[in-house]
């Protein structure tokens, strides 16, 4: 476990893992599937239209821990799930939108004119 | 140390099938995956496919699919390949190897012979 | 699927005499993760291959600081400074960054 404050790299793992990817693959992709020494995920976001898109791919190890912790950006609702333990893990995550907050519907229509 | 163990040769008749076995010790079995080359005199080598141990999760080489099929067990931390309608074009040297991001130990592999 | 090219087949070398062997790969060998994943193996007459260079450039354990791996991209090359009769044998490279994964055609290093 990481105290807080240290910057430790994450631990590399021993094998390469494969993802799923939707929307999010990269060039050395095959069959819709990604490999990494990090991460599998899933995202959720609201695109200019205020719909719902969901995205799946590979994070590299670098910079994933950041990446996987869904710190919330204002005005831009949007989830991500992340998972190591078999491959294609990221199928059977179901990330969901956070809920609209008041000052949203105020300022949704504004920021979208 | 690191130990991939294969049997030395097999001889089959033309559309048989065989399981070609490789007996991994020295390191946890689930931690790395298990690929499977082919070697023909002249040829090169061949990526067959490969297989996550922990939960069986397989890739193919396309130019192998129907061809091979590759399982483990793990509790004799042995991985196997199936190799079925065989022809003389399947007689080669197989190996299996562990692979985490590239192959760091090979097995002896397995002489295979198809002949009537 | 990604063509590795060896070159050359054949390499006459005198005991130590350095070696060079070229390996080109038909698209960049860098994957998403920023890493490149070519790799060199050494086969003897009789034997498996084992692993000499992996990604590039990193020496695998109990291999000679002789042997030295260098390139990116497309274009990468395995030098060996003193060559000794114990590394005789053939040269691949391969790369481990597409599926399906390939190999150079090797490199035969023998005595001049």
């Known amino acids: 476990k990481k105290e807080d404050g240290e910057s430790t790299a994450p631990t590399p793992r021993p094998k390469v893992l494969r993802c799923k990817c939707h929307h999010h693959c990269p060039e050395d992709s095959v069959n819709n599937i990604c490999s990494t020494d990090g991460y599998c995920f899933t995202m959720i976001e609201e695109d200019d239209s205020g719909l719902p898109v969901v995205t799946s791919g590979c994070l590299g190890l670098e910079g994933s821990d950041f990446q996987c912790r869904d710190t919330p950006i204002p005005h831009q609702r949007r989830s991500i799930e992340c998972c190591t333990e078999r491959n294609e893990c990221n199928k059977d995550l179901h990330p969901t939108l956070p809920p609209l907050k008041n000052r949203d519907f105020v300022d949704g229509p504004i920021h979208h004119r | 140390q690191v130990q991939l163990q294969q049997p030395g040769a097999e001889l089959v008749k033309p559309g048989a099938s065989v399981k070609l076995s490789c007996k991994a010790s020295?390191?946890?079995?689930?931690?790395?995956?298990m690929q499977w080359v082919k070697q023909r005199p002249g040829q090169g080598l061949e990526w067959i496919g490969e297989?996550?141990?922990?939960?069986?999760?397989?890739l193919y080489n396309q130019k192998f699919k129907g061809k091979a099929t590759l399982t483990v067990d793990t509790s004799s931390s042995t991985a196997y390949m199936q190799l079925s309608s065989l022809t003389s074009e399947d007689s080669a040297v197989y190996f299996c190897?562990?692979?985490?991001?590239?192959?760091?130990?090979w097995g002896q592999g397995t002489t295979l012979t198809v002949s009537s | 699927d990604v063509v590795m090219t060896q070159t050359p087949l054949s390499l006459p070398v005198s005991l130590g005499d350095q070696a060079s062997i070229s390996c080109r790969s038909s698209?960049?060998?860098?994957?998403?993760?920023?890493?490149?994943?070519l790799h060199w193996y050494l086969q003897k007459p009789g034997q498996s291959p084992k692993l000499l260079i992996y990604?590039?450039?990193n020496r695998f354990s109990g291999v000679p600081d002789r042997f030295s791996g260098s390139g990116s991209g497309t274009d990468f090359t395995l030098k060996i400074s003193r060559v000794e009769a114990e590394d005789l044998g053939v040269y691949f490279c391969?790369?481990?960054?597409?599926?399906?994964?390939?190999f150079g055609s090797g490199t035969k290093l023998e005595i001049k």
């Open positions: 190897a562990r692979f985490g991001y590239y192959i760091e130990y």
């Open positions: 020295g390191y946890t079995f689930t931690s790395y995956w």
């Open positions: 297989i996550d141990p922990s939960d069986s999760y397989t």
């Open positions: 990604k590039v450039s």
């Open positions: 698209q960049s060998l860098v994957h998403s993760t920023g890493n490149t994943y």
């Open positions: 391969s790369q481990s960054t597409h599926v399906p994964f390939t």
